[in-house]
């Protein structure tokens, strides 16, 4: 399955939107910094079957969508930018969804990389617990916004490697 060029553009637009969403300086939130232990190894490996890699990317975007779809999120961010973010993420999910399904039917059901999916889920669990702990403060959301940008940057690299494999 070839990810459409629009997927790359959508990814870039998502990064831009996340940057635009910034409401306060990260420097004023230094005391709230946190290591969420991004599972970098799940994005570095060349050991991935293509279907597995696409599933991992899908999980990152799906969890990001869910994170920013909460009531607490709608209070924290500019509604207009949030709506644009939802649209971008939704489109990317659709692109990846079609690819996952195509990979499934081309080669029978490939083995789901369970540990990679779980690693991504745990990473977002750490983010969720951090926000809860910090009572969804503006600084906590700013730290999370910056972290999600970092994770999208890493997933972009995985997408580029996928494209080179095609």
């Amino acid at each position: 399955c070839d990810l459409p060029q629009t997927h790359s553009l959508g990814h870039r637009r998502t990064m831009m939107l996340l940057a635009q969403m910034r409401r306060i300086s990260l420097f004023s939130c230094l005391k709230d910094r946190h290591d969420f232990r991004f599972p970098q190894e799940e994005f570095d490996g060349n050991q991935f079957q293509k279907a597995e890699a696409i599933s991992v990317l899908h999980e990152v975007i799906q969890q990001t969508f869910n994170l920013f779809s909460t009531k607490d999120s709608s209070v924290a961010w500019d509604e207009r930018l949030l709506d644009k973010l939802y649209t971008e993420l939704y489109q990317q999910l659709n692109d990846l969804e079609a690819c996952v399904m195509q990979e499934v039917w081309v080669g029978g059901t490939p083995l789901m990389n369970e540990d990679s999916i779980l690693a991504v889920r745990k990473y977002f669990q750490r983010i969720t617990l951090y926000l809860t702990e910090k009572k969804y403060s503006p600084c906590a959301w700013e730290v999370v916004r910056a972290e999600i940008m970092r994770s999208f940057s890493s997933s972009r690299n995985l997408q580029e490697r996928l494209r080179r494999k095609e």
């Epitope: 599933s55 799906q62 990846l96 499934v104």
Partner: antibody
Framework: QVQLVQSGAEVKKPGASVKVSCKAS????????MHWVRQAPGQGLEWMGE????????IYNENFKSRVTMTRDTSTSTVYMELSSLRSEDTAVYYC????????????WGQGTLVTVSS | EIVLTQSPATLSLSPGERATLSCSAG???????LYWYQQKPGQAPRLLIY???NLASGIPARFSGSGSGTDFTLTISSLEPEDFAVYYC?????????FGQGTKLEIK
């Protein structure tokens, strides 16, 4: 509000298959993995596996891998769990439970479907 | 597979008393992925505590959770009549996800 409504009780003969449904409402169906958990009479809970309704990929408990199939129908926001080669030990209440994170993990359950396997 | 062993299997106490339920894991479980559920006869399980020590929405403050590594505890500070039920610990730290066999809390 989030609701998971399961299909009714079933009685099956050993060797047959059963297909239990779980209809979701009150949230975006494709955004959350759906899990299946079973409970034999007077026993504890046993996780069977999960399905991502968005693309249909599944992760199964090895104990059920050869006999279980989880599918979904996005047009009706319904997930299905089919268990084949039934034996008497499969007599249990089967629950669907929605995934999520933090306080949302297994925060929503179906009402349960009793499957009785008897000759 | 991470085996969760709950003790005691049955706990007989009176309303107003303090209940301490244990959950022991066969191998280490990150506290973020250890949950507790309550189940009453004929009902689906209900989330009580998430990530070892956080109260789920609508759960009274008499419930609390603690622990780390392989030993986790659910405490009910002063039992109310509606607390008599079966309690399960659950982990999703690694596949396959598992539950303890349950502790039945009954009225003495």
């Amino acid at each position: 509000q989030v609701q998971l409504v399961q299909s009714g009780a079933e009685v099956k003969k050993p060797g047959a298959s059963v297909k239990v449904s779980c209809k979701a409402s009150g949230y975006t169906f494709t955004n959350y993995w759906m899990h299946w958990v079973r409970q034999a009479p007077g026993q504890g809970l046993e996780w069977m596996g999960e399905i991502n309704p968005s693309h249909g990929r599944t992760i199964y408990n090895e104990n059920f891998k050869s006999r279980v199939t989880m599918t979904r129908d996005t047009s009706t926001s319904t997930v299905y769990m089919e268990l084949s080669s039934l034996r008497s030990e499969d007599t249990a209440v089967y629950y669907c439970a929605r995934g999520g994170l933090g306080p949302a993990w297994f925060a929503y359950w179906g009402q349960g479907t009793l499957v009785t396997v008897s000759s | 597979e991470i085996v969760l062993t709950q003790s005691p299997a049955t706990l007989s106490l009176s309303p107003g008393e303090r209940a301490t339920l244990s959950c022991s894991a066969g191998s280490s479980v990150d506290s973020s992925y250890l949950y507790w559920y309550q189940q009453k006869p004929g009902q689906a399980p209900r989330l009580l505590i998430y990530s070892t020590s956080n109260l789920a929405s609508g759960i009274p403050a008499r419930f609390s959770g603690s622990g780390s590594g392989t030993d986790f505890t659910l405490t009910i500070s002063s039992l109310e009549p509606e607390d008599f039920a079966v309690y399960y610990c659950h982990q999703w730290s690694s596949y396959p996800f598992t539950f303890g066999q349950g502790t039945k809390l009954e009225i003495k």
